[in-house]
């Protein structure tokens, strides 16, 4: 599946995402995953994301958004984290959204 | 299966110097941080500090900051920790752990480290 | 640092007893914490992370809960591989810190 370009694994039960993910789908552009159990990003999660221009991640569990996670994503337009737990406005440690 | 293999045991002299290795199969240590954690005999745990395998940079508790240098070799997918200085305070079993979010899900059997004269 | 306050410090249950372990901060760490369990002469197994989220694997007989400074870690059911110290663990800061630990018996 190196060709992908669109994945929508939204309404499951995913819990942990391994960052491996997008190493094995460097084309990826659409990343779905509203509905899931997330409770956390790192600046790891998406690192080999450097694709991404839309990322879906309402209605998960994400509290915690340890040190700057989307600092890769140079092409992003749309990023969707709501209904989730933040409790600030703040992704990060740093400005990472251009 | 991840697997974090650390091996044998060390005997040090004081004021010597010990490197201790951390070789992960299952899992690429570039998408995630490698920890040192240690535990004096019948103690609790003491963290030591992390390192970033993808670009080196490392995270140390206050009291390991001139005790303690972590290294990590991607192409072997390994993590190092030197020991300087040793004293019998350093006596420990010492863990490498992974953990992308600062706590650990995966750790080492451990190595014993001893400094004796 | 961030202190981690863990009591009991030690605890003996019968089978099928429920337990519960306490871990106070010294500051509030939002949720920012993991309970460990170490068997004998064993490396520590994470249980519970982000406070109350089971790892893959543990059995629900374990869970977490708490805020703020508070957090408990409850066995419902114990079993006598449950019989192990037990840590809880914050990472909200750095420098990463533990509590002192709980030394679970069976009575």
């Known amino acids: 599946y190196s060709q992908l370009t669109s994945l929508d694994v939204g309404f499951n039960t995913i819990s942990k995402l391994e960052p491996e993910l997008c190493q094995k789908l460097p084309m990826l552009k659409v990343l779905n995953l509203q509905h899931n159990e997330l409770s956390q990003l790192s600046d790891k999660t998406f690192a080999f994301c450097t694709n991404l221009t839309e990322l879906h991640l309402m209605s998960n569990s994400i509290q915690k958004i340890k040190n700057n996670p989307f600092v890769k994503q140079k092409n992003l337009i749309t990023l969707d984290l709501s209904h989730n737990g933040l409790s600030s406005t703040k992704l990060g440690t740093q400005v990472q959204l251009e | 299966e991840v697997q974090l293999q650390q091996y044998g045991a060390e005997l040090g002299k004081p004021g010597t110097s010990v490197k201790l290795s951390c070789k992960v199969s299952g899992y690429n240590i570039t998408y995630t941080y490698m920890h040192w954690v240690n535990q004096r005999p019948g103690k609790g745990l003491e963290w030591i500090g992390r390192i970033d395998p993808a670009n080196g940079n490392t995270i140390y508790g206050e009291k390991f900051k001139n005790k303690a240098t972590l290294t990590a070799d991607t192409s072997s997918n390994t993590a190092y920790m030197q020991l300087s200085q040793l004293k019998s305070d350093d006596t420990a079993i010492y863990f490498c752990a992974m953990g992308e979010f600062d706590y650990f899900d995966h750790w080492g059997q451990g190595v014993m480290v001893t400094v004796s004269s | 640092d961030i202190q981690m306050t863990q009591s009991p410090a030690s605890l003996s249950a019968s089978l099928g007893e429920t337990v519960s372990i306490e871990c106070l901060a010294s500051?509030?760490?939002?949720?920012?914490l993991a309970w460990y369990q170490q068997k004998s002469g064993k490396s520590p197994q994470v249980l519970i992370y982000?406070?109350?989220r089971l790892e893959d694997g543990v059995p629900s007989r374990f869970s977490g809960s708490g805020s703020g400074t508070r957090y408990s870690l409850k066995i419902s059911g114990m079993q006598p591989e449950d019989e192990a110290d037990y840590f809880c663990?914050?990472?909200?800061?750095?420098?990463?810190?533990f509590g002192s630990g709980t030394k679970l018996e069976i009575k």
């Open positions: 500051e509030d760490i939002s949720n920012d």
């Open positions: 663990q914050q990472s909200y800061k750095y420098p990463v810190t």
């Open positions: 982000a406070a109350s």
